[in-house]
Every structure is written in structure tokens, then in C-alpha cells.
Interface confidence: low
Amino acid sequence: GALEVQVPEDPVVALVGTDATLCCSFSPEPGFSLAQLNLIWQLTDTKQLVHSFAEGQDQGSAYANRTALFPDLLAQGNASLRLQRVRVADEGSFTCFVSIRDFGSAAVSLQVAAPYSKPSMTLEPNKDLRPGDTVTITCSSYQGYPEAEVFWQDGQGVPLTGNVTTSQMANEQGLFDVHSILRVVLGANGTYSCLVRNPVLQQDAHSSVTITPQRSPTGAVEVQVPEDPVVALVGTDATLRCSFSPEPGFSLAQLNLIWQLTDTKQLVHSFTEGRDQGSAYANRTALFPDLLAQGNASLRLQRVRVADEGSFTCFVSIRDFGSAAVSLQVAAPYSKPSMTLEPNKDLRPGDTVTITCSSYRGYPEAEVFWQDGQGVPLTGNVTTSQMANEQGLFDVHSVLRVVLGANGTYSCLVRNPVLQQDAHGSVTITGQPMTFPPEA
């Protein structure tokens, strides 16, 4: 009869830039040798060759040199394919053809995903607001995939659906930047929240802006910064917003602007005597010179690192003087967890197994939850460790020890508390012998 080829029913979800394993297995008969095996991976729709094994040899990748087999496991029937540095363009169906004497095939779907950044909120106009004024609030979230769902609500949690325009634009990597614009008439004051949902990762990123329309007091320069921390992904650029209201006839020659670290008072960047004095912070900062005259004293911090996290103070002096501090919260998404099983074969009900859930290069420290196939939390016999690398990013390893029932599914959820990003992995264990760790 035909050879039975097994692949996961559910799509394999992979984060952009990470590696994905497309699982495929067959049951070799006694006396099977790799010389008999023909294995072909191809794109289901176009039939484009991806990787092959024939005549006892790995024929290599035909797909941008980003694929690999598991040569040591082929003889046990593991025909899985490793796809490295996943891109949006990789999304789709891959077919695994196995031929020995008989032949069989099965298709596995790859679903690509990327978490959306915490939304940034901008307001236009952003000063001298009065109840009854119409304002435009823009919510922007970047570099996610697939397209997001966007929800707006007011401070009472009532959904705002009228006067919302949402656009999503893919960049050259296929990742989407989402910009959602809400037009509202101000009441006495109001909070407006924007929630950007990644439907595949079931990741919600949200931000809110509170508008209190009233005239600023006279006297000291009023310096305005966001109340909420600015959240920036490691390696991206962050804007620490700071603004003041220039009076008529204001010129940049009058302006003294100093950015410094709030705690240590270390100088970060300055503008004095009518000139940008440049970065005093590892040459990674910049002002917006064309916008200074309009009162925009914001600071651009490039290639954000974990060590940048903390409070930055914006000092503005014209004739009067004012200052305000803005917090930078650094974050990095956790990778989709990989699941390993020990022991991983000849399992029987009553055996004690150790399931390890590993997720990499996130920040800050993760929260880890385990649950069984019925959704019941598993809290006993869990040991979680988190280790920071030299960049300050955490690798999390959570170990669950369980006694097997007849069969069972065990899920691990790694949550980034700042990005509100959940990364899930699960493993299903049946009472049958297994020859390699199942992938989530």
C-alpha cells in the first residue's frame, strides 16, 4: 500500500527572522536503508523544489540556501525540514514527498507572524485645546504581520467606530505598519485608547492618550512629555517626545535645550547658542533641527539597547525655564517557544517526563504559564530560569515534570509583560512510541 506520511494538521507559526521546523515523518520498515530513500520538499502550489535527499545523499537546499534536513534522524523516519531566518514571503504550503518502495506525501502550512510594536500616539493640534475642538489622534504601530485589527475606545471603554480611518502599508520585507486615525470632538477631558491586535499571535498592543483641554499657566516654560513610558524594541530607533510653546518672535538663538539622564545627570544631547552641540551619548542621539523653532525638542535615540532603559530629562530654557522627564522602556519580543521532551520515545501512561519550553532573546523578563489540553493551569513541578546574555536579552527555559496519562497536550505560554506579547508552544504526547521530539 501507499506509504503513510505524517505532518501536523495545524499550521506551523513562525516569527519573522526565526527558524521554523516543518515536521514530516514516515515509518521505516525493518532493514530500511537511506540508499532506498527519495525525499523531496517542494512548494505545494508552484511545485518549486525546496530541498531533496536522493541516492543516499542530501542534495541540498534549492531554496535560497535557507533549508536543512535532520540527517541523523532520517533513518528513524524523521523527514522534517528546517527553514532558517523565516521571511513573510515563505508563508504558504510545503509538501513533503517520501518514496521508498511505495510513496506518500502530505502538505504542511507555514504561517508567518511578527508582533506589532506598542502603538505611538500623536495628537493634532496638540496645544491650546478647548472643549468642542476637533482633534485628530493618530495611533501608529510598526513591523507586524499579518495585517492587524485595530480597536478604539474611550475612557469608559465604549468602542469608538465612527470617524476612524485605518491604513496598513507593507514594507519591502512584507511587514505592515498600521496607522489608524480617529477624529473626535473634545469633551471637558477624555482618554482615548487604541488597541492593535495581531490575529495570528493573538497579541494585543495598546496605548492611550489623555487630553485635558485647558490653557497652560503663564510664567515658567511649560515642557510637555508623554505620561506613559516610551516603549522601544531593541535595535530600533526611539523618539523621546518633548515640546514647549514658543512665544511670538521666538528665535533659536534664545534657546537652551539640554537632555540628560534623570538619575545620574549625565549629559545626553544639547542645543545652545543657536547650534546643535551634538550627542554626548555614544553618538546615537539626534534632535529634529527643522522642528525646534516650532517648539519640538524631541530626541531621537538610535539602535536602542537594553542599557538605555530609564528616565531622560528634557530641560528647556528661553527667558524662563522648565523641565520634564520621560521614561524609556526597552523591550524585545520572545521567540516562539521550542519544546523538548525527555525521555522522548517509548512513552507509556504512568511514565514521568520532563518537558522543556525554551524561548529566546526577549526583554524584560517573561512570565511563563503552563496548562494542560483542557486549559487547566499547571503550577506544580515547574522550574523556570531566565538568563541574560551580553546584550541584556533574556533566554527563558521552563521545565515541567508530569506523569503521563493515556495521552495529553501540554502548552507553554511565554508572555512579554511590556509588549503584551504571548508566544505559545505545545506538545501532544500519546501513549505510542515516539522517535523524535514533536514540534509545537
Epitope: 475606545q153 485608547s193 490575529p199 496548562q371 486549559g375
Partner: antibody
């Protein structure tokens, strides 16, 4: 043991207000989405509102801003503030726990508290 | 909003018989992530609802294996293979694919013939 215990129901006149509470024990409250669901005298179930573990709130459109869901993670209490009450708000109000994932099924329910709106 | 329609309204059965309850949605409940968020609850007389089945066919913790869920798209079925006295009550289906709002069916009352 996982427990949800609602309180605060009672008889109120149309236009009045009421605040329901749901005291939670036996699990990490701050890790779960929570919801209010009501059952009408005709025994129909109606979803009222939900609040995620991150504090994002969702409401039934028909409530038009009259109800507010909130949570106190330190005190393990879920609230539902109801104002401008109408006769059609008469129901048994249940608090319910969402799954720890975002699948939005309700795996634990309280016994309910009765709200009667009548003049 | 998604409308959930259950049939029959009332289902008289004899103990030991098989029972089957239908639930139909006004739109497909297949989410863009491939999952189908259709759930079943049982409310016994004088009690609050209890989760039986989540995501079409997954039995919740402690639910006997005589309960099974099936279906796809817009048509779903809850089957009880051998009805026992403790199974009597009102069964509700619900969907959480298209939320908000979370919507429930009108209920099916399982009673003794």
C-alpha cells in the same frame, strides 16, 4: 479551590445605579481575562462586558456606555458599575473567568447575583 | 453581530438514549488563524452555566467522554451518547470568533420523556 462570588445585586428604580462585585479566590486573578454575563428572566444568556488581564475593556453595544467594568488586581475583585438602569437590565448577573489564553471561553462561573429594575 | 440558532428548543429523551443538539451561526466561525471558537455550556436547574466543550470538540476538564462536539464553518453538533439523569438541563452554544460581542444561542432544554 477556584471560586467566584458575586454580590451587590438588589432592587433598584429605573434610572438608578448599582455596583456589582465579584470576589475571586483560588487562582492568579491578574493573569486572567474576566467577564460579566447576564441571564434574562426568559433564560437567555447575554454577554455584558469583558476586561483583559492587561486592563483593556470590551462592552456589548446595547449598553451604550451605561456600564463600566473594572478590576482590582491587588484585592482580587472584579466590578461592574451600572447606571441609568432600565427595566430590560433586570437579570441574573454572573461573573466568569476567561481562559488564560485568549480563546475567550468561560471556564469558571460564579453563582450569580440578581438585579431587579422596577418602579 | 453573529446570531447563534439552536435546535430543538426542547429535547425529550429517555435515560440511556443518544441526544443530539444542533447549533448554527449566521457567519462562518473559522477565525483567520485557522481556529474555530465555538463552545458549549450546560446549565443545570438552579445552577450557573458550566463549560462542557471548547473550540468545537475539546472536552473541558472533568467532562465525561459521553459528550462530544463536532462541526465546522456554520454548523455544529453536540452529542451525548448515553443520557444520564445528571445531564438534564439547558445547553447553550456560544461563539468567540467574532468578538466583541461574545454571543450565545437561545438554549436547548434536555428533559426526560
Amino acid at each position: 479551590e477556584v471560586q467566584l462570588v458575586e454580590s451587590g445585586g438588589g432592587l433598584v428604580k429605573p434610572g438608578g445605579s448599582l455596583k456589582l462585585s465579584c470576589a475571586v479566590s483560588g487562582f492568579t486573578f491578574s493573569s486572567y481575562a474576566m467577564s460579566w454575563v447576564r441571564q434574562t428572566p426568559e433564560k437567555r444568556l447575554e454577554w455584558v462586558a469583558s476586561i483583559t488581564d492587561g486592563g483593556i475593556t470590551f462592552y456589548s453595544d446595547s449598553l451604550k456606555g451605561r456600564f463600566t467594568i473594572s478590576r482590582d488586581n491587588s484585592g482580587n475583585i472584579l466590578y461592574l458599575q451600572m447606571s441609568s438602569l432600565r427595566s430590560e437590565d433586570t437579570a441574573m448577573y454572573f461573573c466568569a473567568r476567561g481562559s488564560i489564553t485568549t480563546d475567550w471561553y468561560f471556564d469558571v462561573w460564579g453563582a450569580g447575583t440578581t438585579v431587579t429594575v422596577s418602579s | 453581530d453573529i446570531v447563534m440558532t439552536q435546535a430543538p428548543l426542547s429535547l425529550p429523551v429517555s435515560l440511556g438514549d443518544q441526544a443530539s443538539i444542533s447549533c448554527r451561526s449566521s457567519q462562518s466561525l473559522v477565525h483567520s488563524n485557522g481556529n474555530t471558537y465555538l463552545h458549549w455550556y450546560l446549565q443545570k436547574p438552579g445552577q450557573s452555566p458550566k463549560l462542557l466543550i471548547y473550540k468545537v470538540s475539546n472536552r473541558f476538564s472533568g467532562v465525561p467522554d459521553r459528550f462530544s462536539g463536532s462541526g465546522s464553518g456554520t454548523d455544529f453538533t453536540l452529542k451525548i451518547s448515553r443520557v444520564e439523569a445528571e445531564d438534564l438541563g439547558v445547553y447553550f452554544c456560544s461563539q468567540s470568533t467574532h468578538v466583541p460581542p461574545y454571543t450565545f444561542g437561545g438554549g436547548t432544554k434536555l428533559e426526560i420523556k
